[in-house]
């Protein structure tokens, strides 16, 4: 079986992995090749190699291979994420179970059957032997660990520390002992990659000497791992295609778990009033197909002869003739009673996520494990294998792949706003998932409201009621406008991007809107030359409860001596108390003859329980709203003034630190006015901007 | 001019089959999720189902089933199949217009058409 | 299933009045994306309100729309003439589900 070629089957395949080593001591093999196949040959066979090759990188992009005498359960050596790299280490160095007598076992076991150290293969105390390293080269005669160089009866042994025991066998399992399974095994994933014949399996992303439709990419949740046993189809146990290209494929030998119980993460939430998923795991007495005609039973061959028995299928619960899913079907079904109509959908049973209680997230939701995967606009979440790449260009950490299955909404990026996925649509790369933060769960997100902990500063220099006119430094300011009128303002954050408020959109047709960018007169009088006329291409709103949206500009604006960005703080940053602010706008100033003038207000930070007594404890702030009291009586912001910016001065730089929304009141004397803290959703923000396309100036 | 207007109702018999088509003008289906919405005589609107931006197809419970929401962006054209119809399904049915891939995150019907009566009766 | 309860059903009162109309949903709304819409006999519905406090576009500031989680209000400051009409509420619900209230008949006093 174990030929020169197809080798690559000895080896466990981590995708987008490379070994880094720590250790400059160990040594490494490089050399240009064109597939890893080339790779796992060498590998296997140590030819021209200093040491035992014991795992193999292969770099996809420069076509090389990397040899390595260590793997990545090595000291001295860590694993690291990187797109061109696939990582192969050879089985039999990180199986902790045996096939057969254990002749390939190259595992760390080094205590024997009764509990006795081994003695190391190069030493000659306390037992003098002939099984030198040098003897048995191939057979890894390393350190103190149970070998079987011979391929004895026993299996896997060694000589023992023990002057009055010459040597014992190591109590080491057989793999198919270990390797257990529930059901028919179609959730088994196990590293069991050898048929019951002995014969080895098929690695699943090679077509040879088979080829076949179960390709990894094409069935990411199937578990299509190297070459081990699995049961993607449906059938009695685990399979695989075998090396024997004259077998073409054969059942594995893959025990039943003893007490035949499935992971909590692989059991399908069993059901009984509607339909969770697939409805895999329906258990309820519908038994009638959606037009109402009666089910054949499961245990019966009339009128339709079919496999489908409650003696193949054990874990299915294909009692009576209820409708089931025991085939991964798109929904629970059952053979008709009709000779003329074979089988049917039960699909009318509801669906769970309509007619139960909602889903819902605690924290940040980074813990949510349900299966809602739809964005809230509707789309169907892509798969996060798909996505890793994307996932990577704006996390510094490898995420928890165990979490990303299928394409379920998830958050393996610690945004502060929930779960969210990626989709399929170009122009909303991803978005949030119409899930909401539990009842009563008060978990902040961030902590410290009212103590400076993180500087909210890194960057520069807001309708205003009896404020006075400004011209200086206020080339961030957008009037947005509605069918040819000012109805908001705004902040340039980015060259393609204002932040504003919701409430300023009243129509959905983005031909409506136009972004003024230099003036000073809302009108637009005098400002001629420093104008700048945007349309609009893309509105993103913010996450649940915030208020506030992006808006994309059709064009990048050109920054000049009018026109400037405006920085974002650090996120979950705190502003001290008595920092001096400002609000900016062009709405209604309370003067009978308003001359359209940009309009500022000076305003002063206020902590969050400070500014709640101010409003007679009827308003409680939370982590996403900031406070600015007015120095001047009735000086704030009001209507028209609404998506413009509170800018805040800190180290000499001016920053956006809260977004103008309606429902506070408007300037009223004594009421400090409540923003939207932009530093609580300015990961948002980065996140929207990164990925986000944008048009290029 | 933007506007959705359907076609297709009828009277047809109980267990019978009905197509109902929702032709747009002035925008283009396949950017915007659209969803039926019907109105029993005398009664209160009731969501019946959308095909969302990608097509994605969600359905109420009692449409589950039954009812099959397509599109043909090529016709710019959304569609309702309904099949093994039954007299409480007799209403006037409105195709609306609902998310846009313009307005990340927004979820409200802005647009509606004139409707299209079916009634379903022996 | 999900319930949206609209309050009262009927109301009845003269033009200049104020007319408040409440919906309550037996679950969350996500993201507080509740909409208003007037009907008038024989025509279809037309927006009012979105996001439950924002003014649809040529919709008079009359009408303005409170609330947040699972209890909604709108509110038409002084009745005119032509808001006699029926007022539904709809909410939309994790899974992409949309729900409407029953309906408010706002008739003449």
């Known amino acids: 079986q174990r030929k020169r070629r197809n080798t690559i089957h000895e080896f466990k395949k981590s995708a987008k992995t490379t070994l880094i080593k720590i250790d400059p001591a160990l040594k490494i093999k490089t050399k240009k090749v064109n597939t890893a196949d080339q790779c796992a040959n060498r590998c296997t066979r140590n030819k021209g190699l200093p040491f035992t090759c014991k795992a193999f990188v292969f770099d996809k992009a420069r076509k090389q291979c990397l040899w390595f005498p260590f793997n990545s359960m090595s000291s001295g050596v860590k694993k690291e994420f990187g797109h061109e790299f696939d990582l192969y280490e050879n089985k039999d160095y990180i199986r902790n179970c045996i096939i057969g007598k254990g002749r390939s076992y190259k595992g760390t076991v080094s205590i024997t059957k009764s509990g006795i150290k081994c003695q190391p293969w190069s030493s000659m105390i306390p037992h003098e032997h002939s099984f030198l390293p040098s003897s048995y080269r191939g057979k890894d005669l390393q350190e103190n660990y149970c070998r079987n160089p011979r391929g004895e009866e026993g299996g896997p042994w060694c000589f023992t520390s023990n002057p009055e025991v010459r040597y014992e066998v190591c109590d080491i399992p057989q793999c198919s002992e270990v390797e257990c399974m529930t059901c028919n095994g179609e959730s088994y994933r196990g590293l069991m990659d050898h048929t019951e014949s002995g014969k080895i399996c098929q690695r699943w992303d090679h077509q040879t000497p088979h080829r076949h439709k179960f390709l990894p990419e094409r069935y990411p949740d199937k578990g299509f791992d190297d070459n081990y046993c699995r049961n993607p189809d449906g059938q009695p146990r685990p399979w695989c295609y075998t090396l024997d290209p004259h077998t073409r494929w054969e059942y594995c030998a893959i025990k039943t778990c003893a007490d035949n119980t499935m992971n909590d993460t692989d059991v399908p939430l069993e059901t009984t009033e509607c339909i969770q998923g697939q409805g895999e795991g329906y258990r309820g007495t519908v038994n009638t197909i959606w037009n109402g005609i009666p089910c054949q039973r499961w245990d019966s061959q009339y009128p339709h002869e079919h496999d489908m028995t409650p003696e193949n299928f054990k874990c299915k619960d294909l009692r009576e003739n209820y409708c089931r899913n025991p085939d991964g079907s798109e929904s629970p079904w059952c053979f008709t009673t009709d000779p003329n109509i074979r089988v049917g959908y039960c699909s009318q049973i509801p669906n769970c996520d309509m007619s139960h209680g909602q889903d819902c997230y605690r924290g940040n939701g980074k813990n949510y494990m349900g299966n809602l995967s739809q964005t809230r606009s509707g789309l169907t979440c892509s798969m996060w294998d798909k996505n890793m790449e994307d996932l990577h260009r704006h996390i510094f950490w490898e995420p928890d792949a165990s979490k990303l299955n299928e394409n379920y909404c998830r958050n393996p990026d610690d945004d502060a706003h929930g779960p969210w996925c990626y989709t399929g649509n170009p122009l909303i790369p991803w978005d949030y998932c119409p899930i909401s933060r539990c009842e009563g769960d008060t978990t902040p997100t961030i902590v410290n409201l009212d103590h400076p902990v993180i500087s909210c500063a890194k960057t520069k220099q807001l309708r205003v009621v009896n404020g006075i006119p400004t011209r200086t430094n206020i080339g961030w300011m957008v009037s947005l406008r509605y069918r040819n009128k000012h109805i908001c303002g705004g902040s340039l954050i980015k060259e393609s991007w204002v932040l504003t408020a919701r409430q300023c959109f009243p129509s959905r047709d983005l031909k409506d809107y136009e972004a003024w960018l230099g003036i000073h007169d809302v009108h637009g009088r005098g400002d001629e030359k420093c104008k700048q006329v945007l349309n609009v291409s893309q509105l993103v709103y913010g996450p649940e409860g915030s208020d506030l949206v992006l808006m994309k500009l059709a064009r990048p604006a050109v920054l000049d001596d009018f026109v400037s960005t405006i920085d974002l703080p650090n996120y979950g940053c705190t502003i001290p108390e008595k920092t001096s602010c400002s609000v900016y706008g062009w709405g209604y100033t309370g003067l009978i003859n308003y001359d359209g003038l940009l309009r500022v207000a000076h305003l002063y930070i206020m902590g969050n329980e400070k500014c709640s007594q101010h409003h007679r404890g009827k308003v409680t702030l939370n982590e996403s709203e900031i406070c600015a009291g007015a120095e001047k009586i009735g000086s704030g912001p009001c209507e028209g003034d609404y998506g413009g910016p509170l800018v805040c001065e800190q180290h000499k730089m001016r920053m956006v630190l809260g977004v103008i929304v309606p429902g506070r009141g408007c300037a009223i004397p004594n009421r400090p006015g409540i923003f939207v803290r932009v530093a609580y959703y300015a990961k948002w923000i980065h996140k929207i901007i990164l990925t986000y396309k944008v048009p290029q100036s | 001019e933007v506007q959705l207007v359907e076609s297709g109702g009828g009277l047809v018999q109980p267990g019978g089959s009905l197509r109902l088509s929702c032709a747009a003008s002035?925008?283009?289906?396949?950017?915007?999720?659209m969803s039926w919405v019907r109105q029993a005589p005398g009664k209160g609107l009731e969501w019946v189902g959308a095909?969302?931006?990608?097509?994605?197809?969600y359905y109420t419970n009692s449409a589950k089933g039954r009812f099959t929401i397509s599109r043909d962006n090529s016709k710019n054209t959304l569609y309702l199949q309904m099949n093994s119809l039954r007299a409480e399904d007799t209403a006037v049915y409105y195709c609306?217009?609902?998310?846009?891939?313009?307005?990340?995150?927004?979820?409200?019907?802005?647009?509606w058409g004139q409707g299209t009566l079916v009634t379903v009766s022996s | 299933d999900i319930q949206m309860t609209q309050s009262p059903s009927s109301v009845s009162a003269s033009v200049g009045d104020r007319v408040t109309i409440t919906c309550q949903s037996s679950?969350?709304?996500?993201?507080?994306?509740l909409s208003w819409y007037q009907q008038k006999p024989g025509k279809a519905p037309k927006l009012l309100i979105y996001?439950?406090?924002s003014l649809a576009s040529g919709v008079p500031s009359r009408f303005s729309g409170s609330g947040s989680g699972t209890d909604f209000t709108l509110t038409i400051s002084s009745l005119q003439p032509e808001d006699f009409a029926t007022y539904y509420c709809?909410?939309?619900?994790?899974?992409?589900?949309?729900?409407f209230g029953g309906g408010t008949k706002v008739e003449i006093k």
């Open positions: 609306a217009r609902g998310e846009y891939a313009g307005v990340v995150g927004s979820n409200y019907f802005d647009l």
């Open positions: 002035g925008f283009t289906v396949s950017s915007n999720g």
């Open positions: 095909s969302s931006i990608d097509g994605t197809t």
């Open positions: 679950q969350r709304i996500y993201s507080n994306w």
């Open positions: 996001a439950a406090s």
């Open positions: 709809a909410g939309y619900y994790s899974g992409h589900i949309y729900s």
